[in-house]
């Protein structure tokens, strides 16, 4: 089935994430809360009234309010998760689908430059689908993915800021660049 009503959720590799059930409040009528990882149709965590909570492995934790915590996210945790909540009569009172996408956090971007030909480079080494932005004295100059190369001509002294970001993280570096009139390294 094509998932059209999934809640897109982003998690950072190696970090924990909580999958919170929107507009749900625990009540006495709730008999069963079941979380499934749909790619292999496997039940991964379950709360049942007056029964021991089930966890398929220790990286999962199920809170009393139905929230599922996945600890130390790995790439194979990227999946579509389904939570089903049932009352004492077996009625499916709430069902939510979570499309969990995982990214590696971006590293701090590195700014380097050469005064010989007034060229500046900003580069990010790590991170999934990073977006790089370069600013000169607060003005946006360029947008790229992993590397930005910029030749500046307006002034030999300027403050450059480079930001790297993705869905799960944001890092930035600032470098005041000053070059002598003759253009020496």
């Amino acid at each position: 089935k094509e998932i059209t009503n999934a809640l897109e959720t982003w998690g950072a590799l190696g970090q924990d994430i909580n999958l919170d059930i929107p507009s749900f409040q625990m009540s006495d009528d709730i008999d069963d809360i079941k979380w499934e990882k749909t790619s292999d149709k496997k039940k991964i965590a379950q709360f049942r009234k007056e029964k021991e909570t089930f966890k398929e492995k220790d990286t999962y934790k199920l809170f009393k309010n139905g929230t599922l915590k996945i600890k130390h996210l790995k790439t194979d945790d990227q999946d579509i998760y389904k939570v089903s909540i049932y009352d004492t009569k077996g009625k499916n009172v709430l069902e939510k689908i979570f499309d969990l996408k995982i990214q590696e956090r971006v590293s701090k971007p590195k700014i380097s430059w050469t005064c010989i030909n007034t060229t500046l480079t900003c580069e990010v080494m790590n991170g999934t689908d990073p977006e790089l932005n370069l600013y000169q004295d607060g003005k946006h100059l360029k947008l790229s993915q992993r590397v930005i190369t910029h030749k500046w001509t307006t002034s030999l002294s300027a403050k450059f800021k480079c930001t790297a970001g993705n869905k799960v993280s944001k890092e930035s570096s600032v470098e005041p660049v000053s070059c002598p009139e003759k253009g020496l390294d």
């Epitope: 149709k41 496997k42 029964k51 089930f54 389904k82 089903s84 077996g90 689908i97």
Partner: antibody, heavy 117, light 107 residues
């Protein structure tokens, strides 16, 4: 009173298609998970497909890609579209209302599907 | 896939006798096991859910026990209408497989 009534069974040639229906009454149909289960002549029970209250579907490998379960909550009806039918699909097909953990609480009377040339 | 093995395949008993039916799972399924009764020409009927929970409308002579991999359905004193085929079903994980069935016949 909960009632499930299947229809649409019959004789079909190998490779053919058939759509089964299950009319539900006596309960809030849209709020319950539903399944189709089949039983080949003189054999045991085999679960065929599942649809959650919200429309999420699961299939076993034996029918995946050939069978499609769907529901029309406005008509209180469950469907099973069966394509590329094989002789081994010959069975009585039951629709059932299930609980939280696959327990099949209410069953229809079944409809016979015969795949033969 | 969880495989359920029922034994014996056939149980020949007289009315009034006690019937003990076994179901063994290939891996632990906690108490996620359900029992059904099926009579010829009829749809199955849920007898017991979660290994031991009784179902409304089912006579008290039917009881279930077990957890993990070994489960038992007991009929304390067989009535003529109890002669049928009994199936166990895995309710723990996908796919929700059934056992091969035990036929309880009149001796």
């Amino acid at each position: 009173e909960v009632q499930l009534v299947e229809s649409g069974g019959g004789l079909v040639q190998p490779g053919g298609s058939l759509r089964l229906s299950c009319a539900a009454s006596g309960f809030a149909f849209s709020s319950y998970d539903m399944s189709w289960v089949r039983q080949a002549p003189g054999k045991g029970l085999e679960w065929v497909s599942y649809i959650s209250g919200g429309g999420f579907t699961y299939y076993p490998d034996t029918v995946k890609g050939r069978f499609t379960i769907s529901r029309d909550n406005s008509k209180n009806t469950l469907y099973l579209q069966m394509n590329s039918l094989r002789a081994e699909d010959t069975a009585v097909y039951y629709c059932a209302r299930q609980g939280a953990n696959w327990e099949l609480v209410y069953w229809g009377q079944g409809t016979l599907v015969t795949v033969s040339s | 896939e969880i495989v359920l093995t029922q034994s014996p395949a056939t149980l020949s008993l007289s009315p009034g006798e006690r019937a003990t039916l076994s179901c063994r799972a290939s891996q632990s399924i906690s108490d996620f096991l359900h029992w059904y009764q099926q009579k010829p020409g009829q749809a199955p009927r849920l007898l017991i859910k979660y290994a031991s929970q009784s179902i409304s409308g089912i006579p008290a002579r039917f009881s279930g026990s077990g957890s993990g991999t070994d489960f038992t359905l007991t009929i304390s004193s067989l009535e003529p209408e109890d002669f049928a085929v009994y199936y166990c079903q895995n309710g723990h994980n996908f796919p929700p497989t059934f056992g091969g069935g035990t036929k309880v016949e009149i001796k």
